[in-house]
């Protein structure tokens, strides 16, 4: 008995060949002996089977002694033994129809799991092996799970179902939804305008959802919502925004926020969440703001930073083109009685300057003492 594997939703063509290369009478029946289709001269006739509206043949091949049964939009329950009766002969073909579906949707959030479930006819014992876009093979039984999806898992996954040494291949396009960066940090001098950008790492035709930026200022005891917004077909509309700070938001993707001024009271960490329509879970991006201020009060030159700095970061005060006068792994440094000239306050990580603020110290003219 010949075995043919089919894919749910696809079309299959079961072959039946007579020894005479001419149009003769034939019938296709199922295992219950119910007629599916046949011919009467050059006319196609159909029986009372449940395949009625999905079964067909190729009349153009009958003259060559070929009498195929074509079944469209295959269903798992179409799995059966089909019998072709021609020239007092019976040809049997066993059709096994398989389906492979993703747990929810093929658009998944970063960190979620992809579960592929194999639908198979009763009595079959298939094995399934999926190949990632980069060629990593994962084997499974009726279900196959891939955990902790990341952006780079996006692409075409090719799954092969093996049964009776025959195979059928499914291609599933997976899109992992995430922001391009999990976290970002912005370093600004006090008073500068701050730009926060949240680019997405995927493109889809229609993107609808809602989002919010929660902010935990270093100086504040609790976090607060700075802005909430809606996303409709890639258009951004602000729903609610705090009065302090008065954030502005771009109307188009990528999501873009502007803080008019970097101030010490705004330094801290934010979490932008984006809930997409018809998706469980949310996309997250962390954003951090570090603010620097250099001031001179009487005989004291001070440099301070606010916000989430690593303990390895170095804060230094130096006179231009000279060695650092003071350099500490702290959030504030100062110099008493600084020399006149252009002073630089530097925040650096392993020698790499992250933030720099210049302040000019004017000479102090002392009145000479008369003899």
């Amino acid at each position: 008995k010949k075995v043919v594997l089919g894919k749910k939703g696809d079309t299959v063509e079961l072959t039946c060949t007579a020894s005479q290369k001419k149009s003769i009478q034939f019938h296709w029946k199922n295992s219950n002996q119910i007629k599916i289709l046949g011919n009467q001269g050059s006319f196609l006739t159909k029986g009372p089977s449940k395949l009625n509206d999905r079964a067909d043949s190729r009349r153009s091949l009958w003259d060559q002694g070929n009498f195929p049964l074509i079944i469209k939009n295959l269903k798992i329950e179409d799995s059966d033994t089909y019998i072709c009766e021609v020239e007092d002969q019976k040809e049997e073909v066993q059709l096994l129809v398989f389906g492979l579906t993703a747990n929810s949707d093929t658009h998944l959030l970063q960190g979620q799991s992809l579960t592929l479930t194999l639908e198979s006819p009763p009595g079959s014992s298939p094995s399934v092996q999926c190949r990632s876009p980069r060629g990593k093979n994962i084997q499974g039984g009726k279900t196959l799970s891939v955990s902790q999806l990341e952006l780079q898992d996006s692409g075409t996954w090719t799954c092969t179902v093996l049964q009776n040494q025959k195979k059928v291949e499914f291609k599933i396009d997976i899109v992992v939804l995430a922001f391009q960066k999990a976290s970002s940090i912005v370093y600004k001098k006090e008073g500068e305008q701050v730009e926060f950008s949240f680019p997405l790492a995927f493109t889809v035709e229609k993107l609808t959802g809602s989002g919010e930026l929660w902010w935990q200022a270093e100086r504040a005891s609790s976090s607060k919502s700075w802005i909430t917004f809606d996303l409709k077909n890639k258009e951004v509309s602000v729903k609610r925004v705090t009065q302090d700070p008065k954030l502005q938001m771009g109307k188009k993707l990528p999501l873009h926020l502007t803080l008019p001024q970097a101030l010490p009271q705004y330094a801290g960490s934010g979490n932008l969440t984006l809930a997409l329509e018809a998706k469980t879970g949310k996309l997250h991006q962390e954003v951090n703001l570090v603010v620097m201020r250099a001031t001179q009060l009487q005989k004291n030159l001070t440099c301070e930073v606010w916000g989430p700095t690593s303990p390895k970061l170095m804060l230094s005060l130096k006179l231009e083109n000279k060695e650092a006068k003071v350099s500490k792994r702290e959030k504030a440094v100062w110099v008493l009685n600084p020399e006149a000239g252009m002073w630089q306050c530097l925040l650096s990580d392993s020698g790499q300057v992250l933030l720099e603020s210049n302040i000019k110290v004017l000479p102090t003219w002392s009145t000479p003492v008369q003899p």
């Epitope: 992809l114 990632s132 876009p133 980069r134 060629g135 990593k136 093979n137 994962i138 084997q139 499974g140 196959l144 799970s145 891939v146 955990s147 902790q148 999806l149 990341e150 952006l151 780079q152 898992d153 692409g155 996954w157 790492a201």
Partner: antibody, heavy 120, light 111 residues
Framework: EVKLQQSGTELMKPGASVKISCKAT????????IEWIKQRPGRGLEWIGE????????NYNEEFTGRATFTADTFSNTAYMQLSSLTSEDSAVYYC?????????????WGAGTTVTVSS | DIVMTQSPASLAVSLGQRATISCRAS??????????MHWYQQKPGQPPKFLIK???NLESGVPARFSGSGSGTDFTLNIHPVEEEDTATYYC?????????FGGGTKLEIK
């Protein structure tokens, strides 16, 4: 803390087989691939293959197909590599490593290595 | 298999200066979106340590003086400014296909 603890040094005869273990702690063992990597003295690193403990899925470098066999015990959170028909070319440090990627290969946590010496 | 070629084989850099290590793949290991290239550091008697994934993404806990760049077939690992503790052998590795392969390594010495 994620850790991979490997079995100790092995001194083997040519033609013999060696089985190295790698015990994982600090994460869900069944969900992440365990990779096996070879490093010969003064030489570079060579990927042998991998196993996904939850499903038993394996992928091998063709160079090692037929000689390397990976298994995993999800009760003890331990992965094993057996290498057969040993020759002096197999004298090396063998590392197990974790790959957090579902469809890719990069290795974020490594065991300390198991030294295998093949000598008659 | 994709062959990864690292240069130079060894490198001596003064403390505080920049170290540049190159890695060339025998075929492109990038799509329009990502480069499937990763970097590791190995100190004598220790296993390799993961530094950078997908050409430029620093693994958490890795100092900002390490940076990666490149696409297609040519990739670079930069360390600036180098510190005493950076004395090690550095390896690149592609994950474009099976089998993933490593470069021969670049030994960095601090003067």
């Amino acid at each position: 803390e994620v850790k991979l603890q490997q079995s100790g040094t092995e001194l083997m005869k040519p033609g013999a087989s060696v089985k190295i273990s790698c015990k994982a702690t600090g994460y869900t063992f069944s969900s992440y691939w365990i990779e096996w990597i070879k490093q010969r003295p003064g030489r570079g690193l060579e990927w042998i293959g991998e196993i996904l403990p939850g499903s038993g899925s394996t992928n091998y470098n063709e160079e090692f197909t037929g000689r390397a066999t990976f298994t995993a015990d999800t009760f003890s959170n331990t992965a094993y590599m057996q290498l057969s028909s040993l020759t002096s070319e197999d004298s090396a440090v063998y590392y197990c490593a974790r790959s957090v990627s579902a469809s890719n290969w990069y290795f974020d946590v490594w065991g300390a290595g198991t030294t295998v010496t093949v000598s008659s | 298999d994709i062959v990864m070629t690292q240069s130079p084989a060894s490198l001596a850099v003064s403390l505080g200066q920049r170290a540049t290590i190159s890695c060339r793949a025998s075929q492109s290991v990038s799509t329009s979106s990502y480069s499937y290239m990763h970097w590791y550091q190995q100190k004598p008697g220790q296993p390799p340590k993961f530094l950078i994934k997908y050409a430029s993404n620093l693994e958490s806990g890795v100092p900002a003086r390490f940076s990666g760049s490149g696409s297609g077939t040519d990739f670079t690992l930069n360390i600036h400014p180098v510190e005493e503790e950076d004395t090690a052998t550095y390896y690149c590795q592609h994950s474009w296909e099976i089998p993933p392969t490593f470069g021969g390594g670049t030994k960095l010495e601090i003067k």
